[in-house]
């Protein structure tokens, strides 16, 4: 069976306190624990939770926790559920509230004579004691015309008379603590000679140019003395004016009218209302010339058929605030419907194309009237004026594939190739009209060609094949000038395409025949021993049926391929000294011979007096210097081949001769002596 | 342990009340002792209705029949009661009473055709 | 309200064979998950309460494990008596719900 341990038990509670409800239970298995308050299931929050079995508040509450908490134990296995005795929280508190007019009904039926009572609103648990204040001063019970009723929480005045004007507040104080009135009492019990607002000046404003009246009234026995003042305290009667304002008439029941106003006449206005006894009463209006700023403007707007949008108009600062409507063809829009107007927003339902247009926002207010236009474009979505076609494109021309549509706003259209974005560049262009121009049509071009056209409605598109009308060509075109060398095997290759398999011939230029050593194999000449007949001028023949005959010359040299006679050695020179470097060629053509040194050719022009360069291709460097050390490269060549051959070249300090060492001592590595 | 009452066949439209009689044993006091009412149709496995605290007449019902199952009990009796009402065909299974999850009465079988 | 999905639907098993059967909550319920067991023409029995713990009766060849959202209960060398229904049942929330259960029969 269940058994409570601990048991809940009723107790005392300070209102925003912490409190705790314990609850222990033993059970033969796992029991599930929780709390009723007042029948129904408690649940955890920030302010009241489960702690283990027990119920903690971590600030309590005399609204909401008050009531009948029991705890609650169940065995779910069992099925068994045992309560706990019934505990509830006597809680302490007390709560501040504002000093409040009983009798009479209102402030206005305020009479001096009168009994006045007042009530504070400060409430607690237990009761608390009161007590009150005037201007801060404490009123003890018994005093002269007023009695404390503190069941009733109650201030009563009688018969009240101005000596009881002031400012009357209460305190409380309980158990739990004290407590002062959150909102105060002014009494104000007139005496008849001081004066009264009757009717008070209100802030205006006006448009330039325009009249502008200011009411004031007092009331006193005997009857008061009013004045106006202008901002700068200059007062203003019928008699003395300020210069700026001439414009001004004081009436006998205190009304000041001011016509023709202008911005200087803006401003704070005192109407001061004075008695025969008591302080002067001044009430204070502004006068405010009427202003309306710009609008800003609106970006034109695209919306959808069937969409619901809305396009807000800003009104522009202005005094008044202006107000706003919006038109339509010169018809102010309605509040409710299709197309209307909520608030500063146009509101377009279900829009329809017939809605495109322009819509007009009217701000106005006295200083005059503003207007801006937004212009709404309804979207559809894109019509074929002209699809894509399969197209056939010849090769080397420029292509056209249409893609013409038409939409609002004007359509973008874009082309995909191979399902990849078409970006424009050197060979496509994307005209205005949607058209794609292929600008020189390549064989790889031929494959799927799709285009779409888009509005903020919608898109369409299409696709279409290109199928690449090649051109007969040679692939790659023959070089118009060839080698072969002397005594050797050698091959001269021609291959061309078109729209058919072109046939390829090979003829001598002058029309004669090939001799027996030279094959046409497929295209390729081929020459089984090169001899010097064999130079000469060749044409490459290449045809098919629709395409017809393609030529391409090629001029063909005999050569003896270049081979060095004399090749530079690696040299070391003292410095000072003067560097020869040997290099002689020999083939047919003659070869021409070049020197690079240090990564750049030497200019035979321009070596200086140090460098010259021999007839038969060798180099000398008189004088030489470190710098002049590095690779030197000669190369030889001529028409129909290139062959180069380097050597370093070392340039050293000379070395002074040790006593040991005679004259005819030879030097420690191999030397140009000059 | 838990005793219920017999097979039942019924028309579409008709109440049933099915009883489960709880037997007293050392130590058990029936008013304490929530009962709970299970459901088992074939290839539906078991479907929990709710339960009831006779002592108190607490009641916690699974959404899905309430307005179609209302639980009342008799402490002098010892006795818990499920009335079934508006029945259907869907309505025709085996109702287990049970005391916790130990203890199951044996079934009552309620048939609904017409 | 908490899902409960039993897996396998059937499990054919051979006498003295080891066997797991698996629950699966759609949220977790911490340790409140029981089995029961069901032979035809006859009432569920409680085999373990919260998740692991044994009831008095039931042979120790029945163990319960996981917690959270995945359970099992492992039948250590299966008996021609243990062969029937197993269903798993949550007490985490209202309303109880139960799995749709597992038929452990004879391969």
């Known amino acids: 069976a269940i058994v409570f341990i601990k048991q809940p038990s009723s107790q005392d509670a300070l209102q925003g306190r912490r409190a705790l409800l314990r609850c222990e239970v033993e059970a033969p298995g796992p029991v599930h624990v929780y709390w009723l308050l007042d029948g129904a299931p408690v649940q955890d929050t920030e302010r009241r939770f489960a702690q283990g079995s027990s119920l903690s508040f971590a600030a309590v509450d005399r609204l909401q926790d008050s009531g009948t908490f029991q705890c609650v134990a169940r065995d779910d296995v069992t099925g068994e559920e045992a309560r706990s005795a019934n505990a509830s929280f006597n809680i302490k508190w007390i709560e501040a509230g504002p000093v409040v007019l009983k009798h009479p009904a209102s402030e206005a039926e305020i009479q001096p004579q009168t009994q006045v009572t007042l009530r504070c609103h400060i409430d607690g648990h237990p009761r608390p004691t009161y007590q009150w204040f005037r201007d801060g001063t404490p009123l003890s019970d018994g005093q002269s015309n007023h009695t404390v009723s503190s069941k009733e929480r109650n201030l009563t005045l009688r018969p009240a008379g101005p000596e009881h004007s002031g400012l009357y507040s209460c305190c409380a104080h309980s158990a739990f603590g004290q407590a002062c009135s959150s909102q105060n009492f002014t009494l104000s019990i007139a005496d008849e000679s001081f004066a009264r607002v009757v009717l008070a000046p209100q802030d205006v404003v006006v448009a330039r140019y325009e009249e502008a009246m200011f009411h004031c009234q007092f009331s006193a026995q005997p009857p008061p003395s009013l004045q106006w003042l202008f901002e700068d305290e200059t007062p203003i009667t019928n008699r003395s004016r300020p210069p700026h304002l001439r414009r001004a008439t004081v009436f006998a029941n205190g009304s000041l009218l001011l016509t023709q106003v202008r911005p200087r006449n803006a401003g704070i206005y005192r109407c001061i209302g004075q008695g025969q006894r008591g302080p002067p009463i001044i009430l204070e209006a502004t006068l405010h010339l009427a202003e309306i700023e710009d609008m800003p403007l609106f970006e034109p707007r695209v919306f959808t058929a069937g969409s619901e949008e809305r396009v807000t108009c800003l009104p522009p600062k202005g005094l008044p605030e202006p107000s706003v409507w919006w038109e339509h063809a010169g018809v102010r829009l309605p509040t409710h419907g299709r197309v209307y107007q909520k608030g500063h927003e146009l509101v377009l339902a279900n829009i329809a194309e017939s809605d495109a247009g322009v819509y007009t926002c009217h701000a106005a207010n006295l200083a005059g009237q503003r207007r801006q236009d937004v212009n709404i474009t309804v979207a559809t979505v894109p019509s074929w004026l002209k699809k894509p076609q399969d197209s056939q494109l010849e090769e080397g021309k420029p292509g056209y594939l249409d893609c013409l549509t038409q939409a609002t706003p004007k359509p973008t259209v874009v082309w995909y190739r191979n399902q990849m974005l078409i970006s424009e560049d050197s060979r496509f262009e994307v005209f205005k009209n949607g058209t794609l121009r292929i600008n020189s049509v390549e064989v790889y071009d031929g494959t799927w060609y799709r285009c779409m056209s888009s509005t903020p409605a919608g898109s369409i598109e299409a696709q279409a094949r290109v199928q690449v009308l090649e051109k007969l060509k040679f692939t790659p075109p023959p070089q118009p000038q060839q080698c072969m060398e002397f005594d050797k095997e050698a091959t001269v290759p021609c291959s061309a395409t078109g729209r058919e398999k072109p046939t390829i011939k090979w003829e001598r230029a002058d029309g004669s025949s090939l001799p027996e050593w030279v094959t046409d194999n497929a295209g390729t000449l081929h020459f089984a021993r090169v001899t010097r007949d064999d130079a000469g001028n060749y044409t490459c023949i290449a045809s098919n049926g629709p395409q017809g005959q393609i030529r391409a010359h090629v001029q063909l040299t005999v050569a003896v391929f270049i081979t060095f006679k004399v090749e530079p050695e690696r040299t070391t020179v003292y410095q000072g000294h003067t560097a020869l470097l040997q290099c002689e060629a020999q083939g047919d053509p003659k070869p021409l011979i070049q020197w690079k040194g240090k990564d750049r050719i030497l200019d035979p022009t321009k070596l200086g007096p140090r460098m010259h360069i021999f007839q038969n291709g060798s180099l000398v460097i008189h004088d030489v210097a470190p710098e002049d050390s590095g690779r030197y490269t000669c190369i030889a060549g001529n028409s129909c081949n290139i062959k180069h051959t380097e050597a370093p070249l070392y340039v050293v300090d000379k070395p002074v001769p040790e006593e040991s060492e005679g004259p005819g001592s030879p030097p420690p590595y191999k030397m140009i002596q000059t | 342990q838990l005793e219920e009452s017999g097979a039942e066949l019924m028309q579409p439209g008709a109440s049933v009340k099915v009883s489960c009689k709880a037997t007293l044993e050392e130590g058990y006091t029936f008013t304490v002792y929530w009962i709970e009412w299970v459901k088992q149709r074939p290839g539906h496995g078991l479907e929990w209705i709710g339960e009831i605290l006779p002592g108190s007449g607490s009641t916690d019902y699974n959404e899905k029949f309430k307005g179609k199952a209302t639980f009342t009990a008799d402490s002098s009796s010892n006795t818990a009661y499920m009335q079934l009402s508006s029945l259907t065909t869907e309505d025709s299974a085996i109702y287990y009473c049970?005391?916790?999850?130990?203890?199951w009465g044996q079934g009552t079988l309620v048939t609904v055709s017409a | 309200d908490i899902v409960l999905t039993q897996s396998p639907a059937t499990l054919s098993v051979t006498p003295g064979d080891s066997v797991s059967l698996s629950c699966r909550a759609s949220?977790?319920?911490?340790?409140?998950l029981h089995w029961y067991q069901q032979k035809s023409h006859a009432s569920p029995r409680l085999l373990i309460k919260y998740a692991s713990q044994s009831i008095s009766g039931i042979p120790s060849r029945f163990s319960g494990s996981g917690s959270g959202t995945d359970f099992t209960l492992s039948i250590n060398s299966v008996e021609t008596e243990d062969f029937g229904m197993y269903f798993c049942q949550q007490s985490y929330s209202w309303p109880r719900t139960f799995g749709g259960g597992t038929k452990l029969e004879i391969k």
């Open positions: 049970a005391r916790g999850k130990l203890h």
């Open positions: 949220q977790s319920v911490s340790n409140n």
